[in-house]
């Protein structure tokens, strides 16, 4: 907390410019008008203020907007955003995707901070759902964003947004998350032809039920082992040896290397030895 002191003669700031970097903390507090700061926030980023000076500027904005900053100020916070606490951010009402992008840019290259998580949460809740443009933006900055959401939060993702999802965005999703995302992906890609459909749906298949895997086995998709290993155990177990052979195509030989790993091990254990022998891979049930 900076003490209230009168501004020295001739030091009253007429605009936000580089001369302010030479001001002591108390001088910034006394000589910079909060309303001026709010209207010229876009200039703050171009000036090499110290962290201590930024604290003073934040304090001035907090006094001016005790109920939370307006979006016109938020959009131009720049590095001052890093000074905000989640509690500060919860007071905001961020509706513009441009504002979101501007603030995410400040944190670019770093892991998602509690501040960023709160900002995203406020933004998405304000919009009511994760639309395609928002998802596009968020996954561009944080490829793991989608998998950081709970299954309940993912349920608000409309199928149309699934088009924005890249395979790497799903790398850290667990089975419960894929259970939610798969039906949305199935709906989103339903009008594509066989081979194109498989390319798009492949990274979501960790949420696919048995009947969909059986259907895929009839379409010569040649699923790779990495995808097969991510399938739900309950979806894999009912598949016959013939269905798995069709599903994997030339990749079926890879089962041998994975025979001690789930879900392959669980599937092998529940097959008739005579059926396994037809694969010629030496798999032992």
């Amino acid at each position: 907390e900076v003490e209230k002191t009168a501004c020295p003669s001739g030091k009253k700031a007429r605009e936000i410019d580089e001369s302010l970097i030479f001001y002591k903390k108390w001088e910034l507090e006394a000589c910079v008008d909060a309303a001026l700061l709010a209207t010229q926030m876009d200039r703050v980023n171009a000036i090499p203020f110290t962290y201590e000076q930024l604290d003073v500027l934040k304090h001035k904005l907090d006094e001016l907007y005790p109920q939370g900053y307006p979006e016109s100020v938020i959009q131009h916070l720049g590095y001052l955003f890093l000074k905000m606490s989640p509690e500060d951010i919860r007071k905001w009402n961020v509706t513009s995707l441009e504002t979101l992008k501007a603030l995410l840019e400040v944190n670019k290259g770093h892991e998602m901070s509690p501040q960023v998580a709160t900002l995203i949460d406020r933004f998405v809740k304000g919009r009511g759902q994760l639309d395609k443009d928002t998802l596009d933006t968020l996954t561009a900055f944080y490829p793991g964003y989608l998998c950081s959401l709970s299954p309940e939060e993912l349920s608000s993702v409309p199928p149309s947004s699934i088009w924005a999802v890249r395979p790497q965005d799903l790398d850290t999703c667990d089975p419960r998350q894929l259970d939610v995302l798969y039906p949305k992906a199935r709906l989103a890609f339903q009008n594509m032809n066989g081979s194109e459909y498989f390319v798009k749906i492949q990274s979501f298949l960790g949420g696919a039920p048995t009947e969909d895997l059986k259907a895929l086995s009839q379409q010569n998709v040649s699923m790779d082992l990495a995808t097969f290993m991510k399938l739900r155990t309950d979806a894999v177990l009912p598949l016959t040896v013939a269905e798995v052979q069709k599903l994997l195509g030339p990749h079926v030989e890879g089962l041998k290397a994975e025979e001690r790993h789930r879900p392959v091990r669980d599937w092998i254990l529940r097959q008739r030895q005579d059926d396994l022998d037809t694969l010629g891979l030496g798999l032992q049930g």
Epitope: D174, P175, M229, T233, H261, R262, L269, R270, Q284
Partner: antibody
Framework: QVQLQESGPGLVKPSETLSLTCTVS??????????WSWIRQPPGKGLEWIGY???????NYNPSLKSRVTISVDTSKNQFSLKLSSVTAADTAVYYC???????????WGQGTMVTVSS | DIQMTQSPSSLSASVGDRVTITCRAS??????LNWYQQKPGKAPKLLIY???SLQSGVPSRFSGSGSGTDFTLTISSLQPEDFATYYC?????????FGGGTKVEIK
């Protein structure tokens, strides 16, 4: 609900064979979704998985114990058994039988039986 | 075989504390990671399966996260009945290895 109960001698002489049986009640050892495991815990130490059996008779053993372990199943008695040969004092432990549910993990355990290897 | 390394091996905490235990696999095990609680003289009890799914009947203060090689068990607000030893276990590979355990003691 399914319950497991271990039985067998509490004292075994070195170089002899340790034999234990696990009786399954309230459910079937022939469950499609379950394998049946033996796990042990030496005094004051951590858990070590010994091996499992499926009702079909298929087995899988801990590589470090494989040469000495045999697990068998008797579906008519709803039991599965453990035999560990050539025991030494290092095999002294609490032996647990457990159900491994394919979707969860070791969700049901016996209360454990202490086996001491000593002459 | 896949090795499972738990840390810390023991910790002291007070009732109400947030407690975090980590488990690291020597190679990727996807989401195939289970957590067990064991009290002295008792059989272990399954708490979390598939890295983050809560076993039926387990209080919601227990949660699990992680995938690949790094996993975490969190107790959001430690209760008197939670003082015990916790083990992670991987069912991905047929060697079914357990971690060395973490003993949670009263401070």
């Amino acid at each position: 609900q399914v319950q497991l109960q271990e039985s067998g001698p509490g004292l075994v002489k070195p170089s002899e064979t340790l034999s234990l049986t696990c009786t399954v009640s309230g459910g079937s050892v022939s469950s499609y979704y379950s394998t049946w495991s033996w796990i042990r815990q030496p005094p004051g130490k951590g858990l070590e998985w010994i091996g499992y059996i499926y009702y079909s008779g298929s087995t899988n053993y801990n590589p470090s114990l494989k040469s000495r372990v045999t697990i068998s199943v008797d579906t008519s008695k709803n039991q599965f058994s453990l035999k560990l040969s050539s025991v030494t004092a290092a095999d002294t432990a609490v032996y647990y039988c457990a159900r491994d549910n394919v979707f969860t993990g070791f969700d049901i355990w016996g209360q454990g039986t202490m086996v001491t290897v000593s002459s | 075989d896949i090795q499972m390394t738990q840390s810390p091996s023991s910790l002291s905490a007070s009732v109400g504390d947030r407690v975090t235990i980590t488990c690291r696999a020597s190679q990727s095990i996807s989401s195939y990671l289970n957590w067990y609680q064991q009290k002295p003289g008792k059989a272990p009890k399954l708490l979390i399966y598939a890295a983050s799914s809560l076993q039926s009947g387990v209080p919601s203060r227990f949660s699990g996260s992680g995938s690949g090689t790094d996993f975490t068990l969190t107790i959001s607000s430690l209760q008197p009945e939670d003082f015990a030893t916790y083990y992670c276990q991987q069912p991905y590979d047929a060697s079914y290895t357990f971690g060395g355990g973490t003993k949670v003691e009263i401070k």
